[in-house]
């Protein structure tokens, strides 16, 4: 699949990622033989980023903008290997995949975790939220599971309506063939949606980290 394709353009980097990369390079120059304690290093980077002014961050934001442009440019000309479909253009009008119960729970308790542990990296915040979720009695998870189920139901109705509306030429093709490919297509789209939810969660965390810094 695409993950193993050497020709596939490198993913775009956020301003914070550029900053961390710079920190790593600086650290390597100063301590070429020292091994890096990843969690300690992440914590220090996060603390440093939080104290930086908007002007100082500007350099990394420019780097991120340039990298985004590079990624978009390269993706336009990228042809995936046979057997792998090129990731579709995301229609902004398409219904958004609903959040899971855990995702809803995280939205409630992420501020507390981040507030109590300001130096924590995104990964460690997620880890703590996971522990919190695991320590929560099944009964206390119910409100989140109920809401997630409701949102999933709504999404399924919305996506069905969206697909029906958005496939005008489907009627011209053979009904049997369409039925056969429908299941495969839905499976692919579900896989893609899952990837999107992960991406969105990462982006949300990155945005939040940057928002916190701006406060």
């Amino acid at each position: 699949m695409g993950k193993g394709d050497p020709k596939k353009p490198r993913g775009k980097m956020s301003s914070y990622a550029f900053f961390v990369q710079t920190c790593r390079e600086e650290h390597k120059k100063k301590h070429p033989d020292a091994s890096v304690n990843f969690s300690e290093f992440s914590k220090k980077c996060s603390e440093r980023w939080k104290t930086m002014s908007a002007k100082e961050k500007g350099k990394f934001e420019d780097m991120a903008k340039a990298d985004k442009a590079r990624y978009e440019r390269e993706m336009k000309t990228y042809i995936p290997p046979k057997g792998e479909t090129k990731k579709k253009f995301k229609d902004p009008n398409a219904p958004k995949r609903p959040p899971s119960a855990f995702f809803l729970f995280c939205s409630e308790y992420r501020p507390k975790i981040k507030g109590e542990h300001p130096g924590l990296s995104i990964g460690d915040v997620a880890k703590k939220l996971g522990e919190m979720w695991n320590n929560t009695a099944a009964d206390d998870k119910q409100p989140y599971e109920k809401k997630a189920a409701k949102l999933k139901e709504k999404y399924e109705k919305d996506i069905a309506a969206y697909r029906a509306k958005g496939k005008p030429d489907a009627a011209k093709k053979g009904v049997v063939k369409a039925e056969k490919s429908k299941k495969k297509k839905e499976e692919e789209e579900d896989e893609e949606d899952e990837e999107d939810e992960e991406e969105e969660e990462d982006e949300e965390d990155e945005d939040e980290e940057e928002d916190d810094d701006d406060e």
């Epitope: 409630e108 507030g115 320590n135 929560t136 009964d139 206390d140 119910q142 409100p143 809401k147």
Partner: antibody, heavy 123, light 107 residues
């Protein structure tokens, strides 16, 4: 100092309404689940209701479902309990309590309590 | 709803005594159990959470044990300020339910 201060209790006739408030201070109110717990004169403790940090999720005891509404205003650090269709059996001291969630494998605990406000339902 | 039954309902003890209060749940609640102390005219105070974890600021003479359906609160050496009513509470399911209380009185 971490503190919860209830107000709004009093004497009300059966069928009447009352709105209790709980002012929080000394901690980041918007991070915590909050609850109301009541205690009838000379009796034990009874959990009434719970609300999530954002206010998006609420739970009620069957005895108050459909009559009581829990809400919160995070900008004012205040928790509320709107009590409608009050009955004589609702007579109690109403405590507002902070709920510490999922801190350990033991789930949740009411770790901070207010001093309580007395609600008397009588004609 | 999960029923919580405490025993005894009341007990008389002297300063320095070792006191044990038990709490039984009507179904298994794992370690989802808390203990509170309440003095007359005052709000309850959390002593023990998650069956055996001591809440910060609570003297070490208080301890909790048990899991499943049977739990115990022990006061190793009763002090004058410990004369109060003690409640157990399950946090395994909604509605949260409390035991009927155990009143510890001076002998």
């Amino acid at each position: 100092e971490v503190q919860l201060l209830e107000s709004g209790g009093g004497l009300v006739q059966p069928g009447g309404s009352l709105r209790l408030s709980c002012a929080a201070s000394g901690f980041t109110f918007s991070w915590y689940d909050m609850s109301w717990v009541r205690q009838a004169p000379g009796k034990g403790l009874e959990w009434v209701s719970r609300i999530s940090p954002s206010g998006g999720y609420t739970m009620y005891a069957d005895s108050v479902k459909g009559r009581f509404t829990i809400s919160r205003d995070n900008s004012k650090n205040t928790l509320y309990l709107q009590m409608n269709s009050l009955r004589a059996e609702d007579t109690a001291v109403y405590y507002c309590a902070r709920l510490e969630v999922g801190a350990t494998s033991g789930g949740t605990a009411f770790d901070i309590w207010g001093q309580g406000t007395m609600v008397t339902v009588s004609s | 709803d999960i029923q919580m039954t405490q025993s005894p309902s009341s007990l008389s003890a002297s300063v320095g005594d070792r006191v044990t209060i038990t709490c039984r749940a009507s179904q298994s609640i794992s370690s989802y159990l808390n203990w509170y102390q309440q003095k007359p005219g005052k709000a309850p105070k959390l002593l023990i959470y998650a069956a055996s974890s001591l809440q910060s600021g609570v003297p070490s003479r208080f301890s909790g044990s048990g899991s499943g359906t049977d739990f115990t609160l022990t006061i190793s050496s009763l002090q004058p300020e410990d004369f109060a009513t003690y409640y157990c509470q399950q946090s395994y399911s909604t509605p949260r339910t409390f035991g009927q209380g155990t009143k510890v009185e001076i002998k």
